[in-house]
């Protein structure tokens, strides 16, 4: 029961953070105007990974794709990459997830299967989560940076006389989206790995218990019919997941390279 | 066709507030659009005073802040200003407008003369 | 506050003349997110409220003669009209449309010689 509860909250929790990559991935306001300590203009300007914004205040809206490849940034390119890979691998991870959930029978599917599906689908959740997190922290670092440059010589004087304010962006809200979906699918996918690890068939661990029958003496061992219903390869299963959770707490580790923010 | 007509009291005392109303036909204040309080001085100074916009915000000219208040009756489809301790330099032309939106273009009321004299 | 300074303060013309006007703000009204420059110009005639002729610097309004054109960026802009006709002697204004408060310059005054 447990184990399906917990199965069944992975998934819902990777979906939602899914829908929040895709979301945050498709969002105008990566990047917003600073409004902080600015002179108050009558036009707001917003970007995004695939197209730039200004809304003037009389709320008209103009939003211009950036319709070159070669032209961008190489680290806006990666951050579309990382969101795209993100977005691809959760896609996947949730097919793959809906055949694995416990509470859905389909044909003669062994637990055996489902603990393996549920593996898999856990792991695409916990590198999608952790592309969103990576995409949407090289790019916040993209803004810092370029914060701090703009700040530097926010006032480019011609000889003192005329002023040219420039335009400073700061965190929009796509990159908050980004990081709670990220870190949904994150938890989702940790989720659904310990769910496989109470879906995989483990030997019963009941002492034997000896039946005395004439003449005999038989041990009985339950579980022993199990091994030789194709079971039987359960300690390997057994190790295969353990090599997972190791795995996990690797990948786990990695996003402290991108926490510079 | 949208129109606007200011309406007001042409002459008021210094010290006095002074309101003036721009009615508007053929478009809602509400839908869109900012609406400015424009005015122009005896010797052809143009000066923005301020808006407010569709959805009930204003901006005002902070040489004006303390002084200036626009509002609106949406029911009536009207926006007002209203200015108060007014002095002598306040004597103008004050026009009410309709704010460019992207390429769509502006409207002006014909203007209402203001006299501030004791 | 944006000062916007225009020059002449008046020009005396004949009509057919090609008439050029500047104005200069103290600050560059460039948008970087749309590549746009934010002055207006308008023309007032006597007794009439300002009517819009060009904005975004450069973009005329429907139903404005191409005998007015706009250029320019940052902070130097020019008011050209080719051609001058009787209709177009008015006084002329440019405007910072992106800084507020919102200002006007104090006109160019257009008059037949």
């Known amino acids: 029961m447990a184990v399906t509860a917990c199965q069944g909250l992975g998934f819902v929790v990777s979906l939602i953070g899914i829908a929040g990559i895709i979301a945050a991935t498709c969002m105008d306001q990566w990047s917003t105007q600073d409004l902080y300590n600015n002179p108050v203009t009558a036009v707001f300007n917003y970007q995004g990974l695939w197209r730039s914004c200004v809304r003037e205040s009389s709320g008209f809206t103009e939003c211009r794709g950036y319709f070159t490849l070669l032209g961008l940034p190489a680290m806006l390119q990666a951050v579309r990459a990382l969101m795209i890979v993100g977005i691809v691998l959760g896609a996947i991870g949730l097919l793959v997830s809906i055949f694995a959930l416990k509470c859905i029978r389909i044909g003669s599917m062994e637990d055996s299967a489902k603990a393996n599906m549920t593996l898999t689908s856990g792991i695409m959740f916990i590198v999608s989560g952790l592309c969103a997190i990576a995409g949407v922290s090289v790019f916040a670092n993209m803004l810092v940076t370029n914060f701090w440059m703009s700040t530097a010589n926010m006032y480019t004087g011609m000889g003192g006389m005329v002023q040219t304010v420039q335009t400073r962006y700061t965190f929009g809200a796509a990159l908050f989206v980004g990081w709670v979906a990220g870190g949904l699918t994150l938890i989702g996918g940790v989720m659904m790995c310990i769910a496989c690890r109470g879906l995989a068939p483990e030997e019963t661990n009941y002492k034997a218990v000896s039946y005395h029958a004439s003449g005999h003496s038989v041990a009985y061992k339950p579980g022993g019919f199990k091994a030789s219903t194709g079971f039987g390869s359960n300690t390997k299963n057994k190790k295969i997941y353990d090599g997972g959770a190791r795995t996990e707490d690797e990948v786990q580790s990695y996003p402290s390279k991108h926490d510079y923010v | 066709d949208v129109q606007l007509q200011e309406s007001g009291p042409g002459l008021v005392k210094p010290s006095q507030s002074l309101s003036l109303t721009c009615s508007v036909t053929?478009?809602?204040?509400?839908?869109?659009?900012?609406w400015n309080w424009i005015r122009q001085s005896p010797g052809n100074k143009l000066e923005w005073m301020g808006h407010i916009t569709y959805d009930g915000s204003n901006n005002y000219n902070p040489s004006l802040k303390n002084r200036i208040s626009i509002t609106r009756d949406t029911s009536k489809n009207q926006f007002f200003l209203k200015l108060n301790s007014v002095t002598t330099e306040d004597t103008a032309t004050y026009f009410c407008?309709?704010?460019?939106?992207?390429?769509?273009?502006?409207?002006w009321g014909q203007g209402t003369t203001l006299t501030v004299s004791s | 506050d944006i000062v916007m300074t225009q020059s002449p303060s008046s020009l005396t013309v004949t009509s057919g003349e090609k008439v050029t006007m500047s104005c200069k703000s103290s600050q560059s009204l460039f948008n970087s997110g749309n590549q746009k420059n934010y002055l207006t110009w308008y023309q007032q005639k006597l007794g009439q409220p300002p009517k819009l002729l060009i904005f975004?610097?450069?973009t005329r309004e429907s139903g404005v003669p191409d005998r007015f054109t706009g250029s320019g960026s940052g902070t130097d802009f020019t008011l050209t009209i080719s051609s001058v006709q009787t209709e177009d002697l008015a006084v002329y204004y440019c405007?910072?449309?992106?800084?507020?408060?919102?200002?006007f310059g104090a006109g160019t005054k257009l008059e037949l010689k």
């Open positions: 053929g478009y809602s204040i509400t839908s869109g659009y900012l």
């Open positions: 975004w610097a450069s």
């Open positions: 407008s309709r704010g460019r939106y992207g390429n769509n273009r502006d409207y």
């Open positions: 405007q910072n449309d992106y800084y507020y408060p919102l200002t």
